[in-house]
Amino acid sequence: PGPPPGSPRASPDPRAELDSTVLLTRSLLEDTRQLTIQLKDKFPADGDHNLDSLPTLAMSAGALGALQLPSVLTRLRADLLSYLRHVQWLRRAMGSSLKTLEPELGTLQTRLDRLLRRLQLLMSRLALPQLPPDPPAPPLAPPSSTWGGIRAAHAILGGLHLTLDWAVRGLLLLKTRL
């Protein structure tokens, strides 16, 4: 008998997957930028705001070159999971106060979730180690006041913007190694 019938190409090649992940990350970065502008317009920030529960920025863009594919994807996935959790918390805790941003915040959450699934799929396709997610973090305390929630929103969107900017650079660099 001749060789067995092959399978039609059913799903994207990991390099194509990486391309679409970069596109999704870029569009999420733009969503975050627009949302940050809206937030600053409606609730001007007085300087930078921090939130202790947010992840620290994974890496400066300059140090990206030394990174390996698994560590970039693993760290990126962990950080984005944390931001997803913070966005969910923000929408729950600040529903009424941030109503003007609500459709956009909902879209951001959906796209963040989609990006996380893309990253996981990419790691599976490449057979890279996928660390178990951290044990569930303690629930985030509700903001002490409306203004506290707005400060948290500034911190979350600002941190997410930096992380996504780092992610786009990192993913583009990784593409050259695939």
């Epitope: 092959g6 399978s7 190409r9 059913a10 799903s11 090649d13 990991p14 390099r15 698994p70 999971l81 996380l116 699934r117 996981q120 799929l121 599976s124 396709r125 490449l126 057979a127 890279l128 180690p129 996928q130 660390l131 178990p132 997610p133 695939l178």
Partner: antibody
Framework: EVQLLESGGGLVQPGGSLRLSCAAS????????MHWVRQAPGKGLEWVAV????????YYADSVKGRFTISRDNSKNTLYLQMNSLRAEDTAVYYC???????WGQGTLVTVSS | QSVLTQPPSASGTPGQRVTISCSGS?????????VHWYQQLPGTAPKLLIY???ERPSGVPDRFSGSKSGTSASLAISGLRSEDEADYYC???????????FGGGTKLTVL
């Protein structure tokens, strides 16, 4: 069209060795993690081993750890499974699979019997 | 004993809708790891049917759909056809193995 073609299966005595090969074509082999998955006669699928796209990560099911070795040659688009100290319970059809796994070969039968 | 639990068998008549469940734990499906589904027709190799919980590879009819909630997932087949008679397996990444784990498989019979 994606093709994965396993070879190297056959009858071997307990304690013996066998080396399976899987020739890949129709896709960018070096961009995919590769798996070996087996299926004992009349049973379900059991994952055996995986190797990352560049060969730097290898993981094994507990049932084969220390006896089986997975490897790949990206220049030849070929995946390998070196099986040593074979046991009767290793009797199965061995499939080579790419990605999630997204693509599967047709399998090669390994029979361990005296 | 499989890490992912599936019913050993399921059945339906042509045109019906059947659902196959896949139950995991907090260490695999419940930890956010995606679920994939495979179809194995008699005497053939498995074929990817659904990936990332609900995505259909090109060429898979939209009669097949997947979903995931909490620590379990399910595969639904609507408009059942005789050619759907096969074994169906779910799979998810297991971090303790650094590899996928498969369910025990569900034999679907079209009556």
């Amino acid at each position: 069209e994606v093709q994965l073609l396993e070879s190297g299966g056959g009858l071997v005595q307990p304690g013996g060795s066998l080396r399976l090969s899987c020739a890949a074509s129709g896709f960018t082999f070096s961009s995919y993690g590769m798996h070996w998955v087996r299926q004992a006669p009349g049973k379900g699928l059991e994952w055996v081993a995986v190797i990352s796209y560049d060969g730097s990560y290898k993981y094994y099911a507990d049932s084969v750890k220390g006896r089986f070795t997975i490897s790949r040659d990206n220049s030849k688009n070929t995946l390998y499974l070196q099986m040593n100290s074979l046991r009767a319970e290793d009797t199965a059809v061995y499939y080579c699979a790419a990605g999630v796994p997204d693509y599967w070969g047709q399998g090669t039968l390994v029979t361990v019997s005296s | 004993q499989s890490v992912l639990t599936q019913p050993p068998s399921a059945s339906g008549t042509p045109g019906q809708r059947v659902t196959i469940s896949c139950s995991g734990s907090s260490s695999n499906i419940g930890s956010g790891y995606d679920v994939h589904w495979y179809q194995q027709l008699p005497g053939t190799a498995p074929k990817l049917l659904i990936y990332s919980n609900e995505e259909r590879p090109s060429g898979v009819p939209d009669r097949f759909s997947g979903s995931k909630s909490g620590t379990s997932a399910s595969l639904a087949i609507s408009g059942l056809r005789s050619e759907d008679e096969a074994d169906y397996y779910c799979a998810a990444w297991d971090p303790s193995l650094s590899g996928p784990v498969f369910g025990g498989g569900t034999k679907l019979t079209v009556l």
